[in-house]
Interface confidence: low
């Protein structure tokens, strides 16, 4: 039959596109295209992505899989989810560390490095908000400590000298 071929594929289902001469069924996620179909509405030859490579979407044209990313050890990143045939490695920060983005318009694919969370206990402070999107949020001084300058200082145990208000339970009141 003469004339130009219509770009629309008259095949059952909607997962067909013109590849080469014919409308072919595409490859599922996790597979790459080895060869297009050899008859109208036929199946393409698809192969599973090799180890350490992936393809996240159904496709009609990818003849190779994408290489899985390696988490940046220099940036203290760890793999939260290992790479599979259908998904890239998901890099993040280990417990006790938080994500510090390296770019301004930050999205999930933006480069980042991991920073250690502030240890409120080591600063003798209550933990008000656990470290997640940003650093730990430390609160007031723990019992037995009082605010002095920027830090928490251990309450005096002796009743000699002054006794800060927050330390009344430790060193008692003096007139």
């Amino acid at each position: 039959q003469g004339g130009t071929r219509s770009p629309r594929c008259d095949c059952a289902g909607d997962f067909h596109k013109k590849i080469g001469l014919f409308c072919c069924r595409g490859c599922p996620a996790g597979h790459y295209l080895k060869a297009p179909c050899t008859e109208p509405c036929g199946n393409s030859t698809c192969l599973v992505c090799p180890q350490d490579t992936f393809l996240a979407w159904e496709n009609h044209h990818n003849s190779e899989c994408a290489r899985c990313q390696a988490c940046d050890e220099q940036a203290s990143q760890v793999a939260l989810e290992n790479c599979s045939a259908v998904a890239d490695t998901r890099c993040g920060c280990k417990p006790g560390w938080f994500v510090e983005c390296q770019v301004s318009q930050c999205v999930s694919s933006s480069p980042f490095y991991c920073q250690p969370c502030l240890d409120c206990g080591a600063l003798h402070r209550h933990t008000r908000l656990l470290c997640s999107r940003r650093d730990t949020d430390c609160g007031t001084c723990l019992p037995g400590f009082y605010e002095h300058g920027d830090g928490c200082v251990s309450c005096p145990t002796s009743t000699l000298g002054s006794c800060p208000e927050r330390c009344a339970a430790v060193c008692g009141w003096r007139q």
């Epitope: 510090e100 933006s110 502030l118 650093d135 949020d137």
Partner: antibody, heavy 121, light 115 residues
């Protein structure tokens, strides 16, 4: 188009209160951290307060801590700054400014046009 | 918290070029900063972020005439082929987390006059 529109400014006496509002549109409000930044006449920019996307983390500048309260209503796409015990040094243009979404990034990528607060007896 | 130092003024001839400097306190020379442009009686506008390695990303609608670079604790904003609309005050700013508290500091601003 991202828009931030401040309101609620005006003339107030020392010791009085004002509440500023910032209405947001053109982006998913609940995904973004927000800040108030002020600018006294002829002076530079001074950060005032910060609130995280779900109000879980709030921070204030030393100059306003204990007097100002930042809050937000994600259902109404609104940011607020309750200003109590106003002082003459609070006189400034007040801007709301958006933090980009996602992780602990430091940027203020969109600003409102500002609302003027004047504290005078 | 970081301290950002800017010179108060700079001038540039029309179609010429100008380079603005923002200097971080030395112990925080690795900090990323942000440049803002504020035209008279207008709100600040995001120009770009600028990392310690000189990489940067500009905001929407910022012309190619604007570029950033870094050297040690210094962060630079360069404007080439200066236009009359570049007449503005340029602030650098840096966000930080200190003892669990998030905040911002800004430089005092550099007023650029286009001659």
């Amino acid at each position: 188009e991202v828009q931030l529109v401040e309101s609620g400014g005006g003339l107030s006496q020392p010791g009085n209160s004002l509440q500023l509002s910032c209405e947001a549109s053109g982006f998913t409000f609940s995904n973004h951290d927000l800040n108030w930044v002020r600018q006294a006449p002829g002076k530079g920019l001074e950060w005032v307060a910060y609130i995280s996307s779900a109000s879980g983390l709030i921070s204030y500048a030393d100059a306003v801590r204990g007097r100002f309260t930042i809050s937000r209503d994600n259902a109404k796409n609104s940011l607020f700054l309750q200003m109590n015990n106003l002082k003459s040094e609070d006189t400034a243009m007040y801007y709301c400014a958006r933090d980009p979404a996602y992780t602990g990034l430091y940027a203020l990528d969109f600003w409102g046009q500002g609302t003027q607060v004047t504290v005078s007896s | 918290q970081p301290v950002l130092t800017q010179s108060p003024s700079a001038s540039a001839s029309l179609s010429g070029s100008v380079k603005l400097t923002c200097t971080l306190s030395s112990e925080l020379s690795w900090y990323t900063i942000v440049w803002y442009q504020q035209r008279p009686d207008k709100a600040p506008k995001y120009v770009m972020y600028l990392k310690s390695d000189g990489s940067h990303s500009k905001g929407d609608g910022i012309p190619d005439r604007f570029s950033g670079s870094s050297s040690g604790a210094h962060r630079y904003l360069s404007i080439s082929n200066v236009q009359s609309e570049d007449d503005a005050t340029y602030f650098c700013g840096a966000g930080y987390t200190l003892a669990g508290q998030y905040g911002w500091v800004f430089g005092s601003g550099t007023k650029v006059t286009v001659l």
